[in-house]
């Protein structure tokens, strides 16, 4: 499994002369995943014109990508650590099928796509250790995920490119919301 940035892998920030707290390690780990998403987005945008497309809404309707809302307790107004952590973990678990879809969608960044997927699994494990209310976390049904994956892979080329773009964009935003919320915990 990938190591956490700030330990043995290349760190996104300065090297540390003292051990990182659990929150700081998670922060660095999310930043590491965001770097990976950035690289994948570069390849996607270079390969097609999806990043400038105005037809995103057409494809977005077919996707049920996790998104932060005020009710999730992760915003400053009405912040609730337990509710928010449940939303973060549940959202990351829901993203896993979409990250699986991204595998084989990249030519020059194949390893990067795998690293994003594996690092997200590690992140989920770290956050599950932090969560008190694990019972409230719903794990997606494997059969539902399998049929969703089949459905996504059966799309035409244009829709597959658009789906790839939307997954990366939504996952980036979800992680950015996570970063901000986790800094309050």
């Amino acid at each position: 499994a990938p190591v956490l940035p700030g330990e043995d892998s290349k760190n996104v920030a300065a090297p540390h002369s003292q051990p990182l707290t659990s929150s700081e390690r998670i922060d660095k780990h999310i930043r590491y995943i965001l770097d990976g998403i950035s690289a994948l987005r570069k390849e996607t945008c270079n390969r097609s014109n999806m990043c400038e497309s105005s037809k995103e809404a057409l494809a977005e309707n077919n996707l049920n990508l996790p998104k932060m809302a005020e009710k999730d307790g992760c915003f400053q107004s009405g912040f609730n650590e337990d509710t928010c952590l449940v939303k973060i973990i549940t959202g990351l678990l829901e993203f896993e099928v979409y990250l699986e879809y991204l595998q084989n969608r990249f030519e020059s960044s194949e390893e990067q796509a795998r690293a994003v997927q594996m690092s997200t699994k590690v992140l989920i494990q770290f956050l599950q250790k932090k969560a008190k209310n694990l019972d409230a976390i719903t794990t997606p049904e494997p059969t539902t995920n399998a049929s969703l994956l089949t459905k996504l892979q059966a799309q035409n080329q244009w829709l597959q490119d658009m789906t790839t773009h939307l997954i990366l964009r939504s996952f980036k935003e979800f992680l950015q919301s996570n970063l901000r919320a986790l800094r309050q915990m």
Partner: antibody
Framework: QVTLKESGPALVKPTQTLTLTCTFS??????????VGWIRQPPGKALEWLAH???????RYNSALKSRLTISKDTSKNQVVLTMTNMDPVDTATYYC??????????????WGQGTLVTVSS | EIVLTQSPDFQSVTPKEKVTITCRAS??????LHWYQQKPDQSPKLLIK???QSISGVPSRFSGSGSGTDFTLTINSLEAEDAATYYC?????????FGQGTKVEIK
């Protein structure tokens, strides 16, 4: 290139409400990870962070001034507005708006406006 | 709230000299510390982020180091245009706070 510009009254009377507008270009508040913050600096003194607003409308205020501050955004106009109620002479300062965030939702200000001096006096 | 204390408050330095400004945090902030330069009658400008990361367009004579509670901004070979007040900022937790500033004057 990224630019920000503050506008508002140069003079306000005690107890009045101050409304400041930050108009920016070169980035968008519809881009995830982005935000705009307000910082002030009384003459000859240090900087003080007041409030900021993020791309998704999440807001944060300096707890010492929270009851007096309101921040809002108009993404289509590329503007962020700060209102501060019950102004007092001690609120005399240069008020700056600045861009915050980025890929890592950084808690830093990487571009600043020129600032606008607000004097509170009767 | 995290209190940042800079030292010295004021420094008068001759050109080409090395300048060292320190910033001490009241509790550990890892490397979430940023440095700004403010020239007279100008707005602040980001110099260094995350304690030691350089910013595009900032001369290489500016560097930063430190982690935890103790941080340093170094100006190697001071130039006349570096006359300014330098501030450190806590980017770790709320409220975001600044040091009181260090004014660097050219002799």
């Amino acid at each position: 290139q990224v630019t920000l510009k503050e506008s508002g009254p140069a003079l306000v009377k005690p107890t009045q409400t101050l409304t400041l507008t930050c108009t920016f270009s070169g980035f968008s508040l519809s881009t995830s990870g982005m935000g705009v913050g307000w910082i002030r600096q009384p003459p000859g003194k240090a900087l003080e962070w007041l409030a900021h607003i993020w791309w998704d409308d999440d807001k944060r205020y300096n707890s010492a001034l929270k009851s007096r501050l309101t921040i809002s955004k108009d993404t289509s106009k590329n503007q962020v507005v700060l209102t501060m109620t019950n102004m007092d002479p001690v609120d005399t300062a240069t008020y700056y708006c600045a861009r915050i965030g980025g890929l890592y939702v950084d808690y830093l200000m990487d571009y600043w406006g020129q600032g606008t001096l607000v004097t509170v006096s009767s | 709230e995290i209190v940042l204390t800079q030292s010295p408050d004021f420094q008068s330095v001759t050109p080409k000299e090395k300048v060292t400004i320190t910033c001490r945090a009241s509790q550990s902030i890892s490397d979430y510390l940023h440095w700004y330069q403010q020239k007279p009658d100008q707005s602040p400008k980001l110099l260094i982020k995350y304690a030691s990361q350089s910013i595009s367009g900032v001369p290489s004579r500016f560097s930063g180091s430190g982690s935890g509670t103790d941080f340093t901004l170094t100006i190697n070979s001071l130039e006349a245009e570096d006359a300014a007040t330098y501030y450190c900022q806590n980017g770790h937790s709320f409220p975001w706070t600044f040091g009181q500033g260090t004014k660097v004057e050219i002799k």
